[in-house]
């Protein structure tokens, strides 16, 4: 058993059919020694009388709020939360497994640029009596300060007779250095409680595999005179770092026609402008990378032909 | 929302057998692990057993164990209580119920409840 937050403890219960289960014992918070009687949740039913109760946790059924009482004054109070193992395997049942890039991915987190910030995000389908709680590291056995703000419901959405809530948190590595050779990996930590289940999911990563650019910004065309050709032109992203002749993004540029069947012209460049052909409704779209490191791509940026 | 709805309950003679189902609308079920409770007349309302989300593990009240087997089709959206040996003192109406909690025989870690079945063992 450990203390999770102040009065909110979690028991360890590596649970099968018929397993004794783990004993605990809890003490009432008072100097007081004699008249002290203890109940669960908002039932009446006296467990046990004396300054500490030894209970066997078995299952959830044993989980709840404890309180201690002395001619009906509230003493103290310990919640008693579960982190259930079976088969060896701690369980996973509040986050859903995103399986990208790979399965048992419940956390994914991504960086628009090197400055230290990023953002995890993970999905659920429970929807009340939830609760989560997020730390992080740069490094584990002589961590690094990293400063994550609030978990919050960011979006929700309808998945067949689902709904799926996804949350998301913001982090920043208190001193980062933007221009550094990564030689430990970030930490994420998320405690989560639903109900009176505890579980808890990590995900460790160097910022440069999560970086993610933002899409291109004011992405132009200029027809060139007496041609079917176009310059197109865009710029660095805001969010990406600087200076640019530094952190060197490249990039992709695709001319697609109305009809997805139709045949893709794409251009790869390191510039801000390149000279495609402009067919009739096609459209033009640029997306970004890192050049000397390949992580991901950018959502694409685009304009209409016409 | 879940709605749950239980069938299968009958008159049987002690030492007989008989399967309840659950069949569960609304939200997605897979999600809910699934319990099984029964209230005799004059009594509280009794844990007989539970199955987790995907099916893989199952937990009894020591009453039942060994006679009833319960097992969960995600594809019907159904939970099943096979009873079997019944005797006398299993007459009861026979609650499914879903939860997010998995072990548990407390009734309040559910949060969805059907109407139940009535279930009578004669001798």
């Known amino acids: 058993i450990w203390e999770l937050k102040k009065d909110v403890y979690v028991v360890e219960l590596d649970w099968y059919p018929d397993a004794p289960g783990e004993m605990v014992v809890l003490t009432c918070d008072t100097p007081e020694e004699d008249g002290i009687t203890w109940t669960l949740d908002q039932s009446s039913e006296v467990l046990g009388s004396g300054k500490t109760l030894t209970i066997q946790v078995k299952e959830f059924g044993d989980a709840g709020q404890y309180t201690c009482h002395k001619g009906g004054e509230v003493l103290s109070h310990s919640l008693l939360l579960l982190h259930k193992k079976e088969d060896g395997i701690w369980s996973t049942d509040i986050l859903k497994d995103q399986k990208e890039p790979k399965n048992k991915t419940f956390l994914r987190c991504e960086a628009k640029n090197y400055s230290g910030r990023f953002t995890c995000w993970w999905l659920t389908t429970i929807s009340t009596d939830l609760t989560f709680s997020v730390k992080s590291s740069r490094g584990s056995s002589d961590p690094q300060g990293v400063t994550c703000g609030a978990a919050t419901l960011s979006a929700e959405r309808v998945r067949g007779d689902n709904k799926e809530y996804e949350y998301s948190v913001e982090c920043q590595e208190d001193s980062a250095c933007p221009a550094a050779e990564e030689s430990l990996p970030i930490e994420v930590m998320v405690d989560a409680v639903h109900k009176l289940k505890y579980e808890n999911y990590t995900s460790s990563f160097f910022i440069r595999d999560i970086i993610k650019p933002d899409p291109p910004k004011n992405l132009q065309l200029k027809p060139l005179k007496n041609s079917r050709q176009v310059e197109v032109s865009w710029e660095y992203p805001d969010t990406w770092s600087t200076p640019h002749s530094y952190f060197s993004l490249t990039f992709c540029v695709q001319v697609q026609g109305k009809s997805k069947r139709e045949k893709k012209d794409r251009v790869f460049t390191d510039k801000t402008s390149a000279t495609v052909i402009c067919r009739k409704n096609a459209s033009i779209s640029v997306r970004a990378q890192d050049r000397y490191y390949s992580s991901s791509w950018s959502e694409w940026a685009s304009v209409p032909c016409s | 929302e879940v709605q749950l709805v239980e069938s299968g309950g009958g008159v049987v003679q002690a030492g007989e057998s008989l399967r309840l189902s659950c069949a569960a609308s609304?939200?997605?079920?897979?999600?809910?692990?699934m319990g099984w409770f029964r209230q005799a007349p004059g009594t509280e309302r009794e844990f007989v057993g539970s199955?987790?989300?995907?099916?893989?593990?199952?937990y009894y009240a020591d009453s039942v164990k060994g006679r009833f087997t319960i097992s969960r089709d995600n594809a019907k959206n159904t939970v099943y209580l096979q009873m079997s040996g019944l005797k006398p003192d299993d007459t009861a109406v026979y609650y499914c119920a879903a939860g997010w909690l998995y072990p548990s025989s407390r009734s309040r870690d559910y949060d969805y409840w059907g109407q139940g079945t009535q279930v009578t063992v004669s001798s």
């Open positions: 199955i987790n989300l995907r099916g893989s593990s199952t």
């Open positions: 609304g939200r997605s079920f897979s999600n809910y692990e």
